[in-house]
Interface confidence: low
């Protein structure tokens, strides 16, 4: 950055160069530049030369006052108008940064996703605190008092093979930036209490004809667990309101749920799980479309594509459709 | 109206000092970020930057002439000084004096300093 | 020192022409680059200042350019009385150097 230049001189910021967003701030610019009394001191941030609120102070230095700074990052330098150089002369530069300390992290989740062989953990870190933060995830064994720290600038990974001292921790977070420190509550955690089952999958769907035509959502999990329990929601895409069905669930075979959809409407499902009883559920699985065929049933292809119908002789009306969705906010 | 005048010896033998004078009018030395520069000519050739000396009498050499060199300056009477001493046949030539002044290059821009008026130049020749 | 190369030498030329010399410094200067114009027997005067800037009464047909290393004037409509020698100066940093100049001559 600009703080690699060689300097000339001296540049420094008061409250400091990391400040918190909004303050009132003062760059003091300071020439040494041999045989150089300067004619006039320039400011440039961004290398944008600054017109305005600079203060001579002596013969060889200036201050520029900004009032209010709202920018997250400024790249600031000075110069000296030295007669003798014939050219402006770079005295030297800095990099200052505004933002905001650390909130107190909350909402602190630990879970293993099967397979994964890993304990993540997250946190809400609160608002965006613009400069570097930085947060130390702290996990103390219950049984064996041991404590460790992992360094991080979001979320963690940890090792479950790291995880030593019994079943039993307590975790919190701690996080700190150069304008202030947080820590969160702390979390009492059971590691069998928090295994977040392997995802289930919706794989098709299809409309059998019937007196009362019924679809069939077939879906499945690659998970070990024995007792699970499971969500799926269903609404028409038109809809704004979801539809809820609980399982309890053995994922021995592929599972086939029954529902009864009103004719030649766009469904959309989702399937969700968790080990009975547990804490965490998955995060809803990816959207998974199914048109229902009107009275005579139909055929439907691969959804978000344009639907194509084929003759009115089929059986069953047969859905692959899936579209990924972002999954926010599921766990919990 | 800025004006500058050079005077010097006209002919000068071998080993001898060559002392110039310029003397100006329109500006002044003791003005902050003035200054006065020598520059010199061979007779069809190009344009050699000797010396300058500044407001506040710092002074600036050529490297490849600095040890014979001697720029000095007489603000009150508005005039500047060039000796060049064991002097050759090689510094025959015209001298020039000229001034260097800031120009304005808008409010968001430092000045820029230019050589910009020149006297008319004093011819010298060196030989024995 | 900062070598200042000038090219061409010397240029035959028709009134009215459009000419172009260069100045190629040995070394980055910035914009830090002057033209000055020399009549046979007279004292050199600047036409352009700092690459690009016209100093005060400098007929707008004579233009400058470039930065960094590489240097352009331009005469637009070339006149009788612009026969002259031109030189570029840097002034980036001591010592001052000059071009060996461009002798205008009519073809």
């Known amino acids: 950055g600009i703080t690699n230049i060689n300097c000339s001189g001296h540049i420094w910021v008061e409250p400091a160069t990391i400040f918190k967003m909004g303050m009132n701030i003062s760059i003091y610019c300071q020439a040494a530049i041999k045989n150089c009394q300067p004619r006039k001191l320039h400011f440039y941030k961004n290398g944008i030369k600054e017109r305005f609120q600079i203060t001579r102070i002596n013969k060889t230095t200036a201050r520029l006052w900004y009032k209010n700074f709202l920018e997250p990052h400024a790249s600031m330098y000075c110069t000296a108008e030295c007669p003798k150089h014939f050219q402006e002369t770079l005295i030297c530069g800095k990099d200052i940064s505004s933002g905001y300390p650390p909130d107190i992290p909350d909402e602190v989740t630990c879970v293993i996703y099967e397979y994964s062989g890993n304990m993540t953990c997250t946190w809400n870190a609160g608002k965006l605190t613009y400069i570097d933060t930085k947060y130390v995830v702290h996990v103390k064994s219950l049984e064996t008092e041991e404590e460790q720290q992992y360094l991080t600038s979001s979320y963690i990974n940890i090792s479950t093979d790291s995880l030593q001292g019994g079943k039993k921790y307590l975790v919190w977070v701690q996080a700190a930036n150069a304008l202030g420190m947080e820590e969160s509550k702390q979390l009492q955690i059971h590691l069998d209490d928090i295994v977040i089952p392997s995802a289930a999958v919706i794989s098709r769907a299809e409309t059998i004809n019937a007196t009362v035509p019924k679809t069939i959502i077939y879906w499945d999990s690659q998970t070990t667990i024995e007792k699970v329990s499971c969500e799926m929601r269903y609404k028409a895409t038109t809809n704004q309101t979801w539809n809820v069905k609980e399982f309890d669930t053995n994922f021995t075979y592929v599972q086939q749920s029954e529902f009864y959809l009103e004719p030649n409407i766009k469904y959309v499902f989702q399937v969700r799980c968790q080990e009975t009883g547990k804490r965490y559920w998955q995060p809803w699985s990816s959207l998974f479309f199914h048109k229902t065929p009107e009275t005579v049933p139909q055929v439907t292809s691969k959804a978000f594509q344009h639907d194509t119908w084929n003759s009115g002789l089929t059986v069953a009306s047969i859905s692959t459709g899936h579209l990924t969705s972002d999954n926010r906010g599921d766990i919990g | 109206q800025v004006t500058l005048k050079e005077s010097g010896p006209g002919i000068l033998q071998p080993s001898q000092t060559l002392s110039l004078t310029c003397t100006f009018s329109g500006f002044s030395l003791s003005t902050y970020g003035m200054g006065v520069g020598w520059i010199r000519q061979p007779s069809g050739k190009g344009l050699e930057w000797l010396a300058n000396i500044w407001w506040d009498d710092d002074k600036y050499y050529n490297p490849s002439l600095k040890n014979r060199l001697t720029i000095s300056k007489d603000t009150s009477n508005n005039q500047a000084f060039l000796k060049i001493t064991n002097v050759d046949t090689a510094d025959t030539a015209t001298y020039y004096c000229?001034?260097?002044?800031?120009?304005?290059?808008?409010?968001?821009?430092?000045?820029?300093?230019?050589?910009?008026?020149w006297g008319q130049g004093a011819s010298v020749t060196v030989s024995s | 020192d900062i070598v200042m190369t000038q090219s061409p030498t010397s240029m035959s030329i028709s009134l009215g022409d459009r000419v172009t010399m260069n100045c190629k410094a040995s070394q980055n200067v910035g914009s830090n680059v002057d033209w000055y114009q020399q009549k046979t027997g007279q004292s050199p005067k600047l036409l352009i200042y700092k690459a690009s800037n016209r100093y005060t009464g400098v007929p707008d047909r004579f233009t400058g350019s470039g930065s960094g290393t590489d240097f352009t004037f331009t005469i637009s409509n070339m006149q009788a009385e612009d026969l002259s020698v031109y030189y570029c100066?840097?002034?980036?940093?001591?010592?001052?150097?000059f071009g060996s100049g461009t002798k205008l001559e009519i073809k």
């Open positions: 100066m840097q002034s980036n940093s001591y010592p001052l150097t």
């Open positions: 000229a001034r260097i002044d800031a120009h304005p290059m808008g409010i968001t821009t430092p000045d820029y300093y230019v050589v910009d008026a």
